[in-house]
């Protein structure tokens, strides 16, 4: 099997772990939850980047 | 192509059970996760849950109370939803979507392929 | 949990003419908030994520806007096949139990006269 990693599952840079039981995402400073989408501030609505123009799988790079 | 196709609908009697399943071709689950959301007749739409099978884990809205169970069978490319104690109230049109969760690294969290649906009656 | 208050219920409009649907989320959810349209015997169909991305093949006459709590869809140069009811739906951190979850507004018929 592939590795899981390479579809860079983890957002806002988080870093991804192939685990066990799945993938684990390690969550850069400031932000939360299983694949770290949500700001650690309610009130930093501005803490989430602009999507890029389509919805289409990246580049395999981590 | 992208396809979610689900089966197991029909008629049951209240306080019965019924698992659906959903079979699901054409992309990769570590991108995508795979949310259950059902409309009852000539109704809005309703969110029950959703499994991120990367991550093994499963979602549910409040409402659920535990009468419902999400689950996957990864090998076969196959996800259930098992329904239980079922009521009137449950009588509705079941669609399994794929939810783009977080695509090269961008968090998106939009239902972008559904299913055809399966008609769920609950009656006696 | 979120509450997604969509409004209005009902809307007409002549074709050529402008629509506005408004999506009121109970809390800040950010920029995910997508929005869909569903006709009659069919699934939905998406529009927009991200409040304002338009998915693949979905005409540039749909644009998605607002953030944390308000949003808007505006449909222009309105045509007959945009008859339909559109939904929104929001994903948002549940804080009483730590996780993402779903909602759906209820819903908005457009009729196109």
């Known amino acids: 099997r592939a590795d899981p990693c390479a579809a860079r599952p983890c957002a806002h840079g988080g870093r991804c772990y192939a685990h066990f039981s799945g993938l684990v995402c390690a969550c850069a400073p400031g932000y939360m939850g299983a694949r770290c989408e949500f700001p650690v501030h309610p009130d930093g609505a501005s803490a989430l980047p602009a999507a890029p123009p389509g919805l289409r799988p990246g580049d395999p790079q981590r | 192509q992208e396809q979610l196709v689900e089966s197991g609908g029909g008629l049951v009697q209240p306080g019965g059970s019924l698992k659906l399943s959903c079979k699901v071709s054409?992309?990769?689950?570590?991108?995508?996760?795979v949310s259950w959301v059902r409309q009852a007749p000539g109704k809005g739409l309703e969110w029950i849950g959703y499994?991120?099978?990367?991550?093994?884990?499963?979602y549910y809205a409040s409402w659920v109370n535990g009468r419902f169970t999400i689950s996957s069978h990864n090998a076969q490319n196959t996800l259930y939803l098992q329904l239980n104690s079922l009521t009137a109230a449950d009588t509705a049109t079941y669609f399994c979507?794929?939810?783009?969760?977080?695509?090269?690294?961008?968090?998106?969290?939009?239902?972008?392929?559904w299913g055809p649906g399966t008609l769920v009656t609950v009656s006696s | 949990d979120v509450v997604m208050t969509q409004t209005p219920a009902s809307v007409e409009a002549a074709v050529g003419g402008t629509v506005t649907i408004n999506c009121q989320a109970s809390?800040?959810?950010?920029?995910?908030l997508s929005w869909y349209q569903q006709k009659p015997g069919q699934p939905p169909k998406l529009l927009i994520y991200?409040?304002?991305t338009l998915a693949s093949g979905v005409p540039s006459r749909f644009k998605g806007s607002g953030s944390g709590t308000q949003f808007t869809l505006t449909i222009s140069d309105l045509e007959c096949a945009d008859a339909a009811t559109y939904y929104c739906?929001?994903?948002?951190?549940?804080?009483?139990?730590?996780?993402?979850?779903?909602?759906f507004g209820g819903g908005t018929e457009v009729v196109v006269k």
């Open positions: 979507v794929r939810v783009a969760l977080v695509v090269a690294g961008v968090a998106y969290y939009g239902m972008d392929v």
């Open positions: 991200r409040t304002s």
């Open positions: 739906q929001s994903y948002y951190y549940s804080s009483g139990s730590s996780y993402g979850a779903f909602a």
């Open positions: 499994i991120d099978p990367a991550f093994g884990r499963t």
């Open positions: 054409g992309f990769d689950f570590s991108n995508y996760g």
């Open positions: 809390q800040n959810i950010y920029s995910y």
